[in-house]
């Protein structure tokens, strides 16, 4: 059967049952995921907006799939095995009375079972297994997976030690409002701004105060963590992402096949081993690549570097440099340059800094 082909998995609680406090629902679901992460290399992150791998839904009757719920009793919940779209999603029958204890139907115990399905497990014939098809209350304080459950899940994902072989370090989510926060790369994607840091990215929708944190691997499983530079050509629905001496092309938010490719295909000399930052200016149809204290200008129409480059950043971008971490283009006249925890709004028509901000100023910090 299907399995998740990545170890960092996101979930989102779409809506909440009125039977329980929201905090109790959050806790029950978080603990249920933890049951499985304790015995596998899998890591689960809750996101509050956007597309999660696993959507948790409370619904009654017909609710958007072929498997309508049946009222109180009978079917308590169901979940879909790993995959895109509805894949992984867990649906809980709102006609049950969901609880934190032995009365009604215990949400934690049911969620452990359903998440087992979300991860690719079928039913077990062992009555002691949480994956046994019928619900039976057990003391949640002493609850343990059975040997059969552990054997099943580890046959799909291995044991927790396999974390050490993951390409992504298990670095925790950076604090968004930490005044010292810096970013690895920033780019617009349509009306959104993507801020990359380690294995995460934040998504900022223009003019909206809310942002959501996501794992890079949850959106683009084939991409590495630690993206170092990014830029968008909106007219082509293309985003270019850079790490080390490689780059990836994303079209309409989908990674293109046959990537990564070498950054040297842009025409960089061999001594360039990585890109610090990049930005595309649609007015000139040029991309600026920032490498250490220099920058190159690339003609996207002719697909070649402009002559006379590299140039010094400090010479041509007054007040910026000598090195930068990230940059993006906005509002038809500004570059936003990021240096450590500071950010500079730069008017490229006036060729000067018009505002100095904290790097995380976009998040209402």
């Amino acid at each position: 059967g299907p399995v998740w082909r990545k170890h960092y998995i996101t979930y989102r609680i779409n809506n909440y049952t009125p039977d329980m406090n929201r905090e109790d629902v959050d806790y029950a679901i978080r603990k249920a995921f933890q049951v499985w992460s304790n015995v596998t290399p899998l890591k689960f992150s809750k996101i509050n907006t956007g597309m999660a791998d696993i959507l948790v839904v409370f619904a009654r009757g017909a609710h958007g799939d072929f498997h309508a719920f049946d009222g109180k009793g009978g079917i308590l919940a169901h979940a879909f095995g790993p995959g895109s779209g509805i894949g992984g999603d867990a649906h809980f029958d709102e006609d049950e009375f969901w609880t934190t204890h032995s009365g009604g139907t215990n949400l934690f115990l049911t969620a452990v079972h359903e998440i087992g399905h979300s991860l690719g497990l079928g039913h077990s014939s062992d009555p002691k297994a949480v994956m046994f098809p019928t619900y039976k209350y057990v003391d949640i304080n002493t609850f343990r997976l059975s040997a059969d459950d552990i054997r099943g899940i580890q046959s799909l994902y291995g044991d927790p030690k396999e974390n050490q072989r993951l390409p992504n370090p298990d670095n925790s989510e950076p604090a968004l409002c930490d005044p010292n926060l810096s970013f690895d790369a920033v780019t617009t994607v349509g009306n959104k701004i993507f801020f990359f840091k380690d294995r995460f990215f934040w998504l900022k929708v223009s003019e909206r105060p809310k942002t959501s944190v996501n794992l890079i691997s949850s959106l683009w499983p084939t991409l590495p963590s630690g993206i170092e530079a990014a830029y968008e050509i909106e007219a082509r629905n293309q985003v270019f992402l850079f790490k080390d001496d490689k780059y990836w092309l994303i079209s309409n938010l989908r990674p293109e096949p046959n990537y990564p490719k070498s950054i040297h295909s842009f025409g960089f000399p061999n001594f360039v081993k990585k890109i610090d930052a990049a930005v595309f200016n649609p007015r000139f149809y040029r991309t600026y690549f920032f490498v250490d204290n220099q920058y190159w200008r690339y003609d996207e129409r002719r697909q070649m570097m402009d002559p006379g480059y590299p140039k010094l950043i400090t010479k041509n971008f007054q007040g910026i440099g000598p090195k930068i971490d990230a940059v993006f283009y906005s509002k038809n006249k500004y570059y936003y340059f990021f240096q450590g925890s500071n950010q500079f709004e730069y008017d490229f028509l006036l060729q000067r800094i018009t505002k100095t901000l904290k790097s995380n100023s976009w998040f209402g910090c």
Epitope: H63, G64, F66, F80, G81, G83, G122
Partner: antibody, heavy 122, light 103 residues
């Protein structure tokens, strides 16, 4: 390459019966839900019936419940639709469609056959 | 029961036009919505699944958006081969279809 080939359509009188078949190839048939979807002449698409990968669960549209029976033979990679008590309003092209999932149906049909025409008329 | 309402039922447009077709559910279906294209005498083909994911091999001029009850299919720049009928679908419910014709 996934291929679905329907057969068994034809002209039948009201009240009569017909059995449609769908021969599948190019994928592991026994792993996936399969469905029948129909389209009356000049009309839109109407889902008819679906069956789980193992054959143990079947679901039907209200319009055909009690008259049509879906089944499958995983050893022959074949899906069937037994249609009894046929009515004029059952006249349609019947398509066989592959779901992308096995345990629960996603309702997402990623491959379709070319269809077979069933005409119910006296 | 869930119902899907698709609009418009027919639409005339020219090559190069941007076209939007909408589909509305009478209750939340999260992002469980798919779009299909059907040409005369042919079987339907999957274009977009899970509201916004482009099926492999489908040109990038097609895009989908929406969640909950309101969904859209957009063709950014119509090509001659795009004139066809489009259906939204959620599980066993199809929209009534939108016939896209040449102006």
């Amino acid at each position: 390459e996934v291929q679905l080939l329907e057969s068994g359509g034809g002209l039948v009188q009201p009240g009569g019966s017909l059995r449609l078949s769908c021969a599948a190839s190019g994928f592991t048939f026994s792993w996936y839900w399969m469905h029948w979807v129909r389209q009356a002449p000049g009309k839109g698409l109407e889902w008819v019936s679906g069956i789980v990968s193992s054959g143990g669960t079947t679901i039907y549209a209200d319009s055909v419940k009690g008259r049509f029976t879906i089944s499958r033979d995983n050893s022959k990679n074949t899906l069937y639709l037994q249609m009894n008590s046929l009515r004029a309003e059952d006249t349609a092209v019947y398509y066989c469609a592959k779901d992308i999932r096995g345990a629960y149906s996603s309702g997402l049909f990623d491959h379709w056959g070319r269809g077979t025409l069933v005409t119910v008329s006296s | 029961d869930i119902q899907m309402t698709q609009s418009p039922s027919s639409l005339s447009a020219s090559v190069g036009d941007r076209v939007t077709i909408t589909c509305r559910a009478n209750q939340s279906i999260y992002t469980y919505l798919n779009w299909y294209q059907q040409k005369p005498g042919k079987a339907p083909e999957l274009l977009i699944y899970a509201a916004s994911s482009l099926q492999s091999g489908v040109p990038s001029r097609f895009s989908g958006s929406g969640s909950g009850t309101d969904f859209t299919l957009t063709i950014s720049s119509l090509q001659p081969e795009d004139f066809a009928t489009y259906y939204c679908q959620q599980a066993g419910i199809f929209g009534q279809g939108t016939k896209l014709e040449i102006k």
